[in-house]
């Protein structure tokens, strides 16, 4: 008696955090005996799609032509061959950008900070959220949420790095999101380019915080340390 | 019980458009796909397309892609099949049929069919 | 697009006869492999879907059977009832085909 079969690959392209408005295709790979590729999304209570393999076979094509809020969401893919349909894949969280206005990011005191010293770079929206997200370009894990805690409404949330090494340098933006939908978020904040410069005595990363051989500081997920700035506000990374 | 009621026969110019709905009633309309068949008289049948009504998602046989279009009304658990630029070729009888997604994806409830008739 | 071939296309039997009807595939469907019966004026009803399985209310003598290309309906002792159009069709890929339909008459 063979296995289960083996669970295909999900994954969207350009990615999986786009644009309202903008395209986007999630493909699935399975094996070359596939016959049918079906695509299911959370909560979607039939099949959400279904395809042919595009030759030779192994994957299939499911477009999204114009991003809006009815895409957003957790999807998994499958695919039949001739003993029956596969395991489903991992999961694959897409996500919209553009469905609230975008917040303002800014650095207290400066943009311009020391090493070894403190910055705190604030998100602040025009109406309440709950959710506010830290992303740092090139990151291979590039959030930080701040979540509210018992739905309670924020118009900022506080994310303080102490002490700022070289590794926290680079450009920033935030996002802002309602707790009844992680999967759409604001449009981005315009960019904020924090400088770390050196100091007489530039203090290296402390073990806890140290990055392995095997990964560069930007593969790491952004770890600020510092109390919780707001009561209401509970941190998660991800 | 399942029902999938049709909207009733219609004449056409070659040229025109004609747009079919399908009414589904006793199950839950968003959980099914909805596929549509014709058949010409005396002749067999022809699968044009399907589409997913609880989020409008079609696939097409490419012989019809280009002039038919499906789309979905959830709010009142209907259907519709539009097909364009119609021919006398077209004369058909248009059925909608559920879908039971499992092994075998088959149609396992029908309408009653929708009489189309292309005359000048 | 894969063609689905039936025969005969018309077959003439009696009450009580036991009648199979064959449906050809141009290509491995992988039991995805269903059937309906169709009567002049009325809508297609499904029998029988993937290959063997019998819809709700489809009285027990009607089967399924096959494998790969080869597939065949069987009605084991014709009713009054029966004498009717049959079709097979494949779900095994899109766009989904109909073999041309075998009509069953009264002999």
């Known amino acids: 008696q063979a296995g289960p079969l083996p669970k295909p690959t999900l994954w969207a392209e350009p990615g999986s955090v786009i644009s309202w408005g903008n395209s986007v295709t999630i493909w699935c790979q399975g094996t070359l005996e596939a016959r049918e590729y079906r695509l299911d999304k959370e909560e979607s209570p039939a099949p959400w799609d279904r395809q042919n393999p595009l030759e030779p076979k192994n994957k299939a094509r499911f477009s999204i032509p114009s991003m809006t809020e009815d895409y957003a969401g957790r999807y998994r893919c499958y695919y039949r061959s001739p003993v029956g349909w596969s395991q489903p894949s991992d999961p694959l969280e897409l996500v919209m950008t553009g469905a609230y206005s975008k917040p303002t990011l800014s650095a207290l005191p400066s943009p311009l900070v020391t090493s070894g010293k403190s910055v705190t770079l604030l998100c602040q929206s025009r109406s309440p959220m709950d959710t506010f997200l830290l992303i740092k370009e090139r990151a291979a894990h590039p959030l930080l949420h701040l979540r509210s805690e018992h739905g309670a409404q924020q118009h900022q949330a506080e994310f303080p790095m102490s002490p700022v090494t070289s590794v926290h340098g680079g450009t920033y933006r935030c996002f802002s999101s309602h707790g009844f939908s992680h999967y759409l978020l604001s449009h981005p904040s315009d960019p904020l380019e924090l400088i770390v410069s050196g100091s007489l005595e530039d203090p290296r990363p402390s073990p806890t915080r140290s990055v392995s051989t095997a990964a560069g500081p930007e593969d790491q997920p952004l770890m600020p340390t510092g109390s919780v700035p707001h009561s209401g506000l509970r941190r998660h990374w991800e | 019980q399942v029902q999938l009621v049709q909207s009733g026969a219609e004449v056409k110019k070659p040229g025109a458009s004609v747009k079919v709905s399908c009414k589904a009633s006793?199950?839950?309309?968003?959980?099914?796909?909805m596929h549509w068949v014709r058949q010409a008289p005396g002749q067999g049948l022809e699968w044009m397309g399907e589409i997913n009504p609880s989020n409008g998602r079609t696939n097409y046989n490419e012989k019809f892609k280009s002039r038919v279009t499906l789309t979905v009304d959830k709010s009142t658990s209907t259907v519709y099949m539009e097909l364009s630029s119609l021919r006398s070729e077209d004369t058909a009888v248009y059925y909608c049929?559920?879908?039971?997604?499992?092994?075998?994806?088959?149609?396992?409830?029908w309408g009653q069919g929708t009489t189309v008739t292309v005359s000048s | 697009d894969i063609q689905m071939t039936q025969s005969p296309s018309s077959l003439s039997a009696s009450v009580g006869d036991r009648v199979t009807i064959t449906c050809r595939a141009s290509?491995?469907?992988?039991?995805?492999l269903n059937w309906y019966q169709q009567k002049p004026g009325k809508a297609p009803k499904l029998l029988i879907y993937y290959t063997s399985r019998l819809h709700s209310g489809v009285p027990s003598r009607f089967s399924g059977s096959g494998s790969g290309t080869e597939y065949t309906l069987t009605i084991s002792s014709l009713q009054p009832d029966d004498f009717a159009t049959y079709y097979c069709q494949q779900g095994d890929t899109l766009p989904r085909t109909f073999g041309q339909g075998t009509r069953l008459e009264i002999k």
């Open positions: 049929a559920r879908d039971r997604y499992d092994e075998g994806n088959a149609m396992d409830y």
């Open positions: 290509q491995d469907i992988t039991n995805y």
């Open positions: 006793g199950y839950t309309f968003t959980s099914y796909w």
